[in-house]
């Protein structure tokens, strides 16, 4: 489909500011009108765009799930930043949910890393120093972890 196959039909809220695209692109915080003549501002707190773009629509702001805290709100140029609550973490392979951190290491292992919003506690074998990953078996000698508090943004769209 060619550019001229698309013509105006955009419905913009009255308060949305308009400006002209630069070389067919609109600045962060805006999306392009259907006819390509205008840049229309995203709606603060509702949607956003982060880069120069030719998007027909701004992207919807992420809403933090229960079990997450909002580190920074959505603006027209940046998505919401959500972080797992203390004592929970988000794994790269399951980014849609926060999981509870383990409370201690299995017998024969020592804790070398705290629970953070982006990682579980880290356990290593006392002798070899090799890492242990996976679910903790019935904990006998537990080394209690105090959940870490450093803030690391974990922004998910959708």
């Amino acid at each position: 489909i060619t550019q001229q196959d698309l013509a105006p039909q955009q419905r913009a809220a009255p308060q949305q500011k308009r400006s002209s695209p630069s070389e067919g692109l609109c600045p962060p915080g805006h999306h392009i009108s259907e006819d390509g003549r205008d840049c229309i501002s995203c709606k603060y707190g509702q949607d956003y765009s982060t880069h120069w773009n030719d998007l027909l629509f701004c992207l919807r702001c992420t809403r933090c799930d229960s079990g997450e805290v909002e580190l920074s709100p959505c603006t027209t140029t940046r998505n919401t930043v959500c972080q797992c609550e203390e004592g929970t973490f988000r794994e790269e392979d399951s980014p849609e949910m926060c999981r509870k951190c383990r409370t201690g290491c299995p017998r024969g292992m020592v804790k070398v890393g705290d629970c953070t919003p982006w990682s579980d506690i880290e356990c290593v074998h006392k002798e070899s120093g090799t890492k242990h990953s996976g679910e903790v078996p019935a904990v006998e000698e537990t080394v209690t972890s105090s959940p870490g508090t450093p803030a690391s943004p974990c922004s998910l769209s959708g």
Epitope: L6, L56, S157, G158
Partner: nanobody, 124 residues
């Protein structure tokens, strides 16, 4: 993951109407822009219509504007394409798509998911 299941295609006389439905399962699509595309044999998939996550901003191809209407019901996780005053040249396989947005010209932007396609045939 999002699965999009389409229904509502079929055979219709020129000048008639059809409504296509696309329902999402597996995850809500209320965060996504939704679009309809169509494809005829030997041709590229063509943008038909799209609307944003909230349903308050729409975009149409010139060839269907004024005849087709895209809408959505986020409570039902569903998007519709109401096709009126159908013409023979509207005959195609129609696909629904969910994407973070669509670029001008119709290309999906970001994560995107597609329905299985549904045949629409307009006879004279």
């Amino acid at each position: 993951q999002v699965q999009l299941v389409q229904s509502g295609g079929g055979l219709v006389q020129a000048g008639g109407s059809l409504r296509l439905t696309c329902t999402a399962s597996g995850r809500t699509v209320s965060n996504y822009a939704m679009g309809w595309f169509r494809q005829t044999p030997g041709k590229d998939r063509e943008f038909v219509a799209a609307l944003n996550w909230s349903g308050d901003t729409t975009s149409y191809a010139d060839s269907v504007r004024g005849r087709f209407t895209i809408s959505r019901d986020n409570t039902r996780n569903t998007v519709y394409l109401q096709m009126d005053s159908l013409k023979r040249e509207d005959t195609a396989v129609y696909y629904c798509a969910a994407a973070q947005s669509f670029r001008r010209g119709g290309a999906p932007y970001g994560d995107n998911y597609w329905g299985q396609g549904t045949q629409v045939t307009v006879s004279s």
